[in-house]
Interface confidence: medium
């Protein structure tokens, strides 16, 4: 069963400021990855961004910079000021869709009590499904 | 616009082949994943092969595997599905559906289908 | 593979209605997609992503769910909606079709 990890960091040089890792661990090929927050894609999450191999990289305030690490992982900067912007407990979720598996996603928040700059490593977060 | 035209279908004897073509055009072809879906007599929807952009991974139910080949040439923007050791069972409207990754994959255009019968 | 049980498979209903359809899984599936199809038509693609609505589709037509159960919603029901509705998911493969449900107008 294909699996999605999920991490959230806040940045040490800015304390408003997030980095948000996500990655696909399944043997099929990624073509799009859609990273959103406040919940699962179509479930009340906001789309932030979403990753498309071929037809490039699509991002909305307070997204800063998407981009792929790997062939299977992504990376994503968010801004940290204005009314709009993430605050410690907000959940962020990361949808895969992955040929032949279909879509799966899962989703992650600032561990409790981080400090800022530090982060463990990446595990595979629960699938979680849109309700 | 996006175009798909199934063709190739007919009258065949049980443990006969036959060729499915479908012609795409209004898109471009090599960047999406294709399936032919087949609906039954009993209006049931079957995915029989699904083939990525690529055309390297091809997927089969094990209803037909080992008896359906899925292909394509992207330079002919044409999908093909050969069909051999037909059975009954295998009567069916095919129908060639695009993928769109951006839908998640959803069969986001179909071709009109084309009439396969199998009876001796 | 995963099986999709659709009810009801007949159902009848008044113009300006609301009709909500089912579908259940025999597992666990991640997202539903749904597609409409008039006699004498190919399917055409409804929802996506269970919620999302398909480029041209009207704003009537909801979809919901998670888990093992999913349902399609049109919240005023016009005549143009007669036809069969099909699940279908892709959360292992093959990807797999309910048998429909079929939407008749009173």
């Known amino acids: 069963t294909p699996e999605v990890w999920v991490q959230v960091r806040m940045e040490a040089t800015e304390l408003s400021s997030f980095t948000i890792r996500c990655g696909f661990l399944g043997s099929g090929s990624i073509s799009l990855v859609t990273v959103s927050w406040g919940g699962p894609n179509g479930a009340g999450g906001t789309t932030l961004a979403v990753l498309h191999p071929e037809r490039g990289i699509r991002q909305w305030a307070p997204a800063r910079q998407a981009r792929w690490e790997t062939q299977s992982s992504i990376s994503l900067i968010l801004e940290g000021s204005g009314a709009s912007s993430p605050c410690a407990n907000t959940t962020f979720c990361c949808k895969f869709a992955s040929f032949p598996e279909g879509s799966w996603e899962a989703c992650g928040s600032l561990p409790p009590s981080s400090d800022p700059g530090l982060s463990a490593p990446p595990t595979p977060a629960p699938i979680l499904r849109a309700d | 616009e996006v175009q798909l035209v199934e063709s190739g279908g007919g009258l065949v004897k049980p443990g006969g082949s036959l060729k499915l073509s479908c012609a795409a055009s209004?898109?471009?072809?090599?960047?999406?994943?294709m399936s032919w879906v087949r609906q039954t007599p009993a209006m049931r929807l079957e995915s029989v092969a699904t083939?990525?952009?690529?055309?390297?991974?091809?997927y089969y139910p094990d209803t037909v595997k080992g008896r359906f080949t899925v292909s394509r040439d992207n330079a002919k923007n044409t999908l093909y599905l050969q069909m051999s050791s037909l059975r009954s069972e295998d009567t069916a409207i095919y129908y060639c559906a695009r993928h769109d990754d951006f839908l998640y994959y959803a069969m986001d255009y179909w071709g009109q289908g084309t009439s396969v019968t199998v009876s001796s | 593979q995963i099986v999709l049980t659709q009810s009801p498979a007949i159902m009848s209903a008044s113009p300006g209605e609301k009709v909500t359809m089912t579908c259940s899984a025999s597992s666990s599936v991640n997202y539903m997609f749904w597609y409409q199809q008039k006699p004498g038509s190919s399917p055409r693609l409804l929802i996506y992503?269970?919620?999302n609505l398909a480029s041209g589709v009207p704003v009537r037509f909801s979809g919901s769910g998670s888990g093992t159960s999913y349902s399609l919603t049109i919240s005023r029901l016009e005549a143009e909606d007669a036809a069969t509705y099909y699940c279908q998911q892709w959360t292992s493969y093959p990807l797999t079709f309910g048998a429909g449900t079929k939407l008749d107008l009173k």
């Open positions: 992503d269970t919620s």
């Open positions: 083939i990525v952009n690529g055309g390297i991974n091809t």
């Open positions: 209004g898109f471009t072809f090599s960047n999406f994943a």
